[in-house]
């Protein structure tokens, strides 16, 4: 998906209301020092692109973080402002259909949020030239 | 079977109300971002508002009009349209963005 036409404004706004606050709660009881940020994004639609990517797509350590509640709120944004986004069907959806009753959150699935936190951080400062 | 069924759509005059409803089986709705989209004839499908752990999203064009509710003990979300203008006439859907639609609902807002 191609996020260049998004509302990137209120996108953003839907990432300091509600999205980073989920985040943060996620990560509750980790040190903001723990995991060093190895992912970036040079503009907007990039970041978006990579937050698409880790937030949806499986990963060895981290089978999905799409049943998360920071998750859902990302998708139901884009849904909104990004045209064209929600007939895309994202495949790590499927999986939440049947939900495991206790949650297990690894190390891994950690230092992946830690890595959305960076990339949304990113996103809210485009005009900032890339370290 | 796992589907989404909308109902609620019809003919309203401008100015008035409907309320359509998206009755979700084979799932619970609640484990999902869902959404409702609309196309009028000849245009792109758009998001019209959305909704996530009781977190709502509006398209600028009806913000203010239109209510997106889940009643998770229903299976069923719901889109309540205020202040309908002829430009609110398209086939409503209802989703599980993402994964799965309904198969619309018609809404002509017409005098």
């Known amino acids: 998906y191609d996020f260049t036409n998004c509302d990137f404004e209120k996108i953003k706004a839907a990432y300091l209301s509600t999205i980073s606050k989920d985040l943060i709660t996620y990560m509750s009881g980790t040190k903001s020092t723990e995991f060093n940020n190895t992912v970036s994004c040079s503009n907007r639609p990039h970041c978006l692109t990579e937050i698409q990517s880790l937030t949806f797509n499986p990963t060895a350590g981290c089978a999905s973080l799409a049943k998360e509640m920071f998750a859902m709120k990302t998708k139901a944004a884009l849904a909104i402002w990004c045209p064209g986004y929600s007939e895309t069907q994202i495949n790590a959806t499927q999986a939440m259909k049947k939900r495991r009753k206790r949650k297990v959150t690894t190390n891994k699935c950690l230092e992946q949020v830690s890595q959305l936190q960076g990339l949304w951080r990113r996103f809210n400062r485009p005009l900032l030239k890339q370290q | 079977e796992v589907q989404l069924v909308e109902s609620g759509g019809g003919l309203v005059q401008p100015g008035g109300s409907l309320r359509l409803s998206c009755a979700a089986s084979g799932f619970k709705l609640g484990y999902y971002a869902m959404g409702w989209f609309r196309q009028a004839p000849g245009k792109e499908r758009e998001g019209v508002a959305t909704?996530?752990?009781?977190?709502?999203y509006y398209a600028d064009s009806v913000k203010g009009r239109f209510t997106i509710s889940a009643d998770n003990s229903k299976n069923t979300a719901y889109l309540q349209m205020n202040s309908l203008k002829p430009e609110d006439t398209a086939v409503y859907y209802c989703a599980a963005i993402g994964w799965r639609w309904g198969q619309g609902t018609l809404v002509t807002v017409s005098s």
């Open positions: 909704i996530a752990g009781g977190t709502t």
